[in-house]
């Protein structure tokens, strides 16, 4: 099973050496967006109804305080990056902590300058990993030197960072916001007419959890080749569940030969193409 995870993504920008006021931030819980930083309100806000319903007001106060502090640190760090030429630059920090099935924990943070990874840190061991490129090496040295001057960036600070992240993750799990549950998908198949006797059939799976799903078209029970199908990304739907789709083109009149095959969390099912005038077939969830 995938570990439970809490991930924060912060970004600050600078233009011609001028660092923006404020920062951009979002948070993901078990891969689901649950938090965004509203720079107009200067507040962490719930993202998605599920986060708003389950997590109390104190959550957003705590998250705001922590993000503000992290954002200020990131702004100060960007100010000290020496190689800034003219133009727009970004400094991004992705911080992740995980709780695995065997109760072991992991914690890391990763720094990107203009989208390029230049430093990864293990928050438990304080070990740093720097990519081989000379630019990454220079940036990492630049940043770690600045942190050494900053008394806050001690080993105790990193341990506290990890403990704080895990504490939040455990609290969110207890609140039931990310209880490991299986929500089977709703599957529906739609047809749309296309010229020259071909039709496009689309199979949509929605409101499922966890994220992993197999969705594919079959002809006479055999899966179609990859290059004859078009897949959508598996995306959060804002309700703590996911959605995706797969489409293919078939000859009109051959609808009965095609089925949409779905496999999710050990369950599977096939969904036929609607024939004749009934161009939409809704397959209800079977819990």
């Amino acid at each position: 099973a995938e570990p439970h995870s809490l991930r924060y993504n912060l970004m600050v920008l600078s233009q011609d050496g001028s660092v923006q006021s404020g920062f951009l931030a979002e948070g993901h819980l078990d891969g689901q967006p649950f938090l965004r930083y509203d720079r107009q309100k200067r507040r962490a806000k719930p993202q998605g109804q599920w986060a708003e319903n389950v997590l109390g007001a104190k959550t957003w106060d705590t998250e705001t305080e922590d993000l503000t502090e992290n954002g200020q640190d990131l702004r100060r760090t960007l100010t000290h990056i020496k190689d800034q030429k003219g133009g727009l630059h970004s400094l991004q920090e992705i911080r992740v902590c995980e709780i695995h099935e065997d109760s072991s924990t992991r914690g890391s943070r990763h720094f990107y300058y203009d989208g390029e990874l230049f430093l990864s840190q293990n928050l438990e061991t304080q070990e740093s990993t720097v990519p081989q490129s000379s630019r990454a090496q220079t940036l990492a040295m630049n940043v770690t030197n600045f942190w050494k001057e900053d008394a806050m960036k001690t080993k105790t600070h990193y341990r506290a960072m990890q403990a704080d992240c895990l504490q939040k993750l455990q609290r969110y799990l207890k609140s039931g916001v990310a209880i490991r549950r299986t929500v089977p998908p709703m599957v529906n198949v739609t047809c749309s007419e296309v010229s020259e006797g071909n039709i496009t059939v689309t199979c949509r799976a929605s409101s499922f959890y966890p994220r992993n799903i197999t969705l594919t078209w079959r002809q006479d029970g055999v899966s179609l080749s990859h290059n004859t199908q078009q897949w959508g990304d598996v995306l959060p739907d804002g309700n703590g569940t996911y959605q995706t789709w797969v489409a293919t083109r078939i000859r009109q009149g051959e609808e009965q030969r095609f089925t949409c095959y779905m496999e999710h969390s050990g369950n599977h099912g096939t969904h036929p193409v609607p024939s004749g005038k009934a161009l939409v077939l809704q397959s209800q969830r079977t819990d």
């Epitope: 233009q15 660092v19 006021s21 404020g22 107009q40 309100k41 305080e65 727009l88």
Partner: antibody
């Protein structure tokens, strides 16, 4: 509905301190946003003076830093501007406004004249 | 400090006409710009944020565009109630600053 209303003395003598109050109704100043003071000089030029955020942190325009203080009284849902050692060039209409980046709600403004 | 320049101080346009008001920043502000309308005796009113996002309740004849250092407020089909002074404001970095304003009149 969110409403902001400025109040103040109208006339202040040079070298004195100016104190203005912004009373907010329909929204708690401790909920979120930053709460700003902006002034408009007789020639219509607008100047952002500073803010106090919902958490109580402040940020001031460096051009006023040595003279300005923004505070609040959360029990009355009010925030205040104090400007020390005023000069005639501080004559302006003073507005309070809500916003952490841009300003979506403004008071109607209070006119302040600095004159002996 | 970032300086915002509104080169046109006054604009005279016919009713029903189209207006564009320019705002130039002294540095790139990456769309972190707002537009306000101010009528005599009133406080400024927010029209547009993030260079292009129209505020709720603002008529669709108003629109914002631009990027980098150069931004524009456009008004199509000018109405009498649009007579006002228009200001731009950036929020890239503090101190936040305003443009000098463009006063719009009916020809």
């Amino acid at each position: 509905e969110v409403q902001l209303e400025e109040s103040g003395p109208g006339l202040v003598k040079p070298s004195q301190s100016l104190s203005l109050t912004c009373t907010v109704t329909g929204y708690s100043i401790t909920s979120d946003y930053a709460w700003n003071w902006i002034r408009q000089f007789p020639g219509n030029k607008l100047e952002w003076m500073g803010y106090i955020s919902y958490s109580g942190s402040t940020n001031y325009n460096p051009s006023l830093k040595s003279r300005i203080s923004i505070t609040r009284d959360t029990s009355k849902n009010q925030f205040f501007l104090q400007l020390n050692s005023v000069i005639t060039e501080d004559t302006a209409t003073y507005y309070c406004a809500r916003g952490g980046t841009y300003f979506d709600y403004w008071g109607q403004g209070t006119t302040l004249t600095v004159s002996s | 400090d970032i300086v915002l320049t509104q080169t046109t101080s006054y604009l005279s346009v016919s009713l029903g006409g189209r207006v564009t008001i320019a705002c130039k920043a002294s540095a790139h502000i990456n769309n972190w710009l707002a537009w306000y309308q101010q009528k005599p005796g009133n406080a400024p009113r927010l029209l547009i944020s993030d260079a292009t996002s129209l505020e709720t309740g603002v008529p669709s004849r108003f629109s914002g565009s631009g990027s980098g250092k150069d931004y524009t407020l456009s008004i199509t089909s000018l109405q009498t109630e649009d007579v006002a002074t228009y200001y731009c404001q950036h929020y890239w970095s503090t101190p936040w600053t305003f443009g000098g304003g463009t006063k719009l009149e009916i020809k």
